[in-house]
């Protein structure tokens, strides 16, 4: 408060939050994601709000399509600037299928290991971004349960672009991506009309992620 007892700047911006979180972003890079620039713009806007460092927030990125790739580990970069540069360089790897359960499971089993930089006692957060129903849905229930068992908080984002472009029903897709999100679903699930609209959820997503350590 000010000397005149006025409330001044009472809400700190997200980027000033020097909280400790291990965040792994699980990106769908299958062929139907278009344009990829929208995904990297979303990453840029989200990451620049974070205070990244070995004693602050750490970020790793996993990309999946028909298989899975670790783009970079949690402990690879020690500043927001370095992560931003690396994230801009991520190329879309494509894929004939959308293996969402595989992407999530690989993040859980591999990306969140100490060998890749995960820290003991630090909250684990996963952000899953996808534009289509998984081809490995038959594995999804178990994969989500495994994440629950390891206390991994999950935010899921459904990009409806390919469905809208093809005039397809989004109902089953939205249902599936909601099932990935942690409870309460309304605070952990987002959907956007297309890839370009990803940037519109960044502020709210960022706030909800960092509210986990409030």
């Amino acid at each position: 408060v000010s000397p005149t007892f006025q409330v001044v700047n009472s809400i700190a911006p997200v980027q000033e939050c020097s909280t400790q979180l291990d965040i792994v972003i699980v990106l769908d890079g299958s062929n139907s994601i278009y344009p990829w620039d929208s995904v990297t713009a979303f990453l840029n806007d989200l990451l620049e709000r974070m205070d990244i460092g070995p004693k602050q927030t750490q970020v790793g990125i996993v990309q999946y399509g028909e298989n899975v790739t670790h783009e970079f580990n949690l402990n690879k970069y020690s500043s927001t600037e370095e992560v931003l540069v690396a994230a801009k360089k991520i190329v879309q790897r494509g894929g004939r299928q959308t293996m969402t359960a595989l992407g999530i499971d690989t993040a859980r089993k591999e990306a969140f290991t100490e060998a890749r930089g995960a820290r003991r006692g630090v909250k684990k957060v996963m952000v899953i971004v996808t534009d289509g129903e998984s081809h490995d849905n038959h594995r999804l229930k178990q994969v989500i349960q495994d994440c629950e068992d390891e206390n991994i908080q999950r935010f899921s984002i459904a990009i409806l672009g390919s469905y809208n472009r093809g005039n397809l029903s989004t109902e089953k897709f939205v249902e599936e991506i909601k099932s990935i999100a942690s409870e309460p679903t309304e605070k952990h699930f987002f959907n956007v009309s297309d890839e370009l609209a990803l940037v519109t959820i960044v502020k709210t997503l960022g706030e909800r992620i960092f509210a986990l350590e409030a």
């Epitope: 298989n67 129903e133 490995d136 849905n137 038959h138 594995r139 229930k141 093809g166 089953k172 599936e176």
Partner: antibody
Framework: EVQLVESGGGLVKPGGSLRLSCAAS????????MSWVRQAPGKGLEWVGR??????????DYAAPVKGRFTISRDDSRNTLYLQMNSLKTEDTAVYYC???????????WGQGTTVTVSS | DIQMTQSPSSLSASVGDRVTITCRAS??????LNWYQQKPGKAPKLLIY???SLESGVPSRFSGSGSGTDFTLTISSLQPEDFATYYC?????????FGQGTKVEIK
């Protein structure tokens, strides 16, 4: 529990027809690519064909020995996969399995199989 | 079509033995190679996917290795329940193709 249950096998004469069914449960069937695989008595495994999901065009692919005679279809509202077999030959005698198919895992879920015998 | 060649076609071994089965693809399939176990009268069961990943619930004595064209399935210490037929399969391209199988019998 993820489960596939085949039915419809039986004895049929050469030149005859048969339709096999595969009932799926425990997962969102409409998401999956499905395959049929067969195994002749005392022989190895042979892929028969595959159907993609509706959002991928529901396209089908077949092994050379069955192309033009066998047709794979699906009814997502009934969670059921079908194999329509026409112009059957004695060499089509086999146990027929339905499977979920992905490039990464291959065929990670199988039904128990249904036996087709083609004999005069 | 990609041809898959397994060797040996059969082998005799004792409980506790280390068993190795090889599979060769006629062209590179990266790591899109799966191994299945089949017992008489039963459906095949996935053991190893993506050349080296152990399927959930499969004992750790089973392991897979290789990339490109040459692959190996190893059973580190053969158990009585491991006597079965083993198949490799490529899922890199359509049609997916199987090896001819390796029957593991009791010595």
């Amino acid at each position: 529990e993820v489960q596939l249950v085949e039915s419809g096998g039986g004895l049929v004469k050469p030149g005859g027809s048969l339709r096999l069914s595969c009932a799926a449960s425990g997962f969102t069937f409409s998401n999956a690519w499905m395959s049929w695989v067969r195994q002749a008595p005392g022989k190895g495994l042979e892929w028969v064909g595959r159907i993609k999901r509706k959002t991928d065009g529901e396209t089908t692919d077949y092994a050379a020995p069955v192309k033009g005679r066998f047709t794979i279809s699906r009814d997502d509202s009934r969670n059921t996969l079908y194999l329509q077999m026409n112009s059957l030959k004695t060499e089509d005698t086999a146990v027929y399995y339905c499977t979920i198919y992905t490039y990464y895992y291959g065929m990670d879920v199988w039904g128990q199989g249904t036996t087709v015998t083609v004999s005069s | 079509d990609i041809q898959m060649t397994q060797s040996p076609s059969s082998l005799s071994a004792s409980v506790g033995d280390r068993v190795t089965i090889t599979c060769r693809a006629s062209q590179s399939i990266n790591n899109y190679l799966n191994w299945y176990q089949q017992k008489p009268g039963k459906a095949p069961k996935l053991l190893i996917y993506a050349a080296s990943s152990l399927e959930s619930g499969v004992p750790s004595r089973f392991s897979g290795s290789g990339s490109g064209t040459d692959f190996t399935l190893t059973i580190s210490s053969l158990q009585p329940e491991d006597f079965a037929t083993y198949y490799c399969q490529q899922s890199y391209s359509t049609p997916p193709t199987f090896g001819q199988g390796t029957k593991v019998e009791i010595k």
